[in-house]
């Protein structure tokens, strides 16, 4: 999203991206910030009691294509959104749980914000 008065020239994404992390902080993270060559993510999952659990962190560039799309999970709900446009961009991601289907969560799109 561009704010008024912002340049329309694409801003190159940082080579090393810093992301907020919660529940997915690697051992070397400081102040709930992790670093990656890939993407920041925020994820929502439904636990066994039906409560939503929101977590966030870093994803490496390798394999982020399939991480950032909603791969089906049997009998449970999970949704993930990814971003790269600036440091800590995942603070502004708010994925929502997919609707309950007849049985399982079906295929979803790739979520890049």
């Amino acid at each position: 999203k561009k704010e008024d008065g912002e340049s329309t020239a694409p801003t190159p994404r940082p080579k090393i991206l810093r992301c907020k992390c919660h529940h997915h902080c690697p051992e070397d993270s400081v102040n709930n910030i992790c670093s990656t060559d890939g993407y920041c993510f925020t994820m929502i999952e439904e636990d066994d009691s039906g409560m939503p659990v929101v977590t966030s962190g870093c994803l490496g560039l390798e394999g982020s294509d399939f991480q950032c799309r909603d791969t089906p999970i049997p009998h449970q709900r999970r949704s993930i959104e990814c971003c790269t446009e600036r440091n800590e961009c995942n603070k502004d991601l708010h994925p929502t749980l997919p609707p309950l289907k007849n049985r399982d969560f079906v295929d979803g799109p790739i979520h890049h914000k």
Epitope: P26, T55, G57, R77, R78
Partner: antibody, heavy 124, light 107 residues
Framework: QVQLQQPGAELVKPGASVKLSCKAS????????MHWVKQRPGQGLEWIGM????????NYNESFKSKATLTVDKSSSTAYMQLSSLTSEDSAVYYC?????????????????WGQGTILTVSS | DIQMTQTTSSLSASLGDRVTISCRAS??????LNWYQQKPDGTIKFLIY???RLHSGVPSRFSGSGSGTDYSLTIRNLEQEDIATYFC?????????FGGGTKLEIK
Amino acid sequence: QVQLQQPGAELVKPGASVKLSCKASGYTFISYWMHWVKQRPGQGLEWIGMIHPNSGSTNYNESFKSKATLTVDKSSSTAYMQLSSLTSEDSAVYYCARDLLIATVVVTPYFAYWGQGTILTVSS
Amino acid sequence: DIQMTQTTSSLSASLGDRVTISCRASQDISNFLNWYQQKPDGTIKFLIYYTSRLHSGVPSRFSGSGSGTDYSLTIRNLEQEDIATYFCQQGNTLPYTFGGGTKLEIK
């Protein structure tokens, strides 16, 4: 890149226990389920169970509940499987495998990255 | 437990052939079907997940299809490096279970 290192072989006596290790690198260890799989010589694959390193949550195949115990050491990014009361039936190759998807509470069924396997021989 | 059956335990084909390996589940597994390749040295690779999605780095000559209880893995233009044993695995219901494997050999 994702790597799972397992010792090549272990030789143990019947009745004893053994703790097999799987050292992970190249990713955030606490973010993915780790699975363990058994393969007897010339046979198929059997899923033993899975552990989530962050929560320590486990799911076991009922057939292995009294045989295997899964644990992790987050500080060394290592997953362990202890096998108890060993018999010749436990002689097999044991693989650890990291799941495909990042997860916190949901259970995910995709064994995306495999260790080389540890050959366990139970013999007196 | 869900039983996974690979009726063909071994298969002989020529380089360049199109090969199809089948797998049947004892009940509907809602497309939660994965394929693995085990090389003669024991190395195991993840090929296809959720019936038809190719894992990173897997050549496009591999494809998967199926639904309900019947699934298949197809290898187009068979190459020497594809000589291996192929296992299917259901991920719909715990405990996860594997087929018995199909060993692919060169004619």
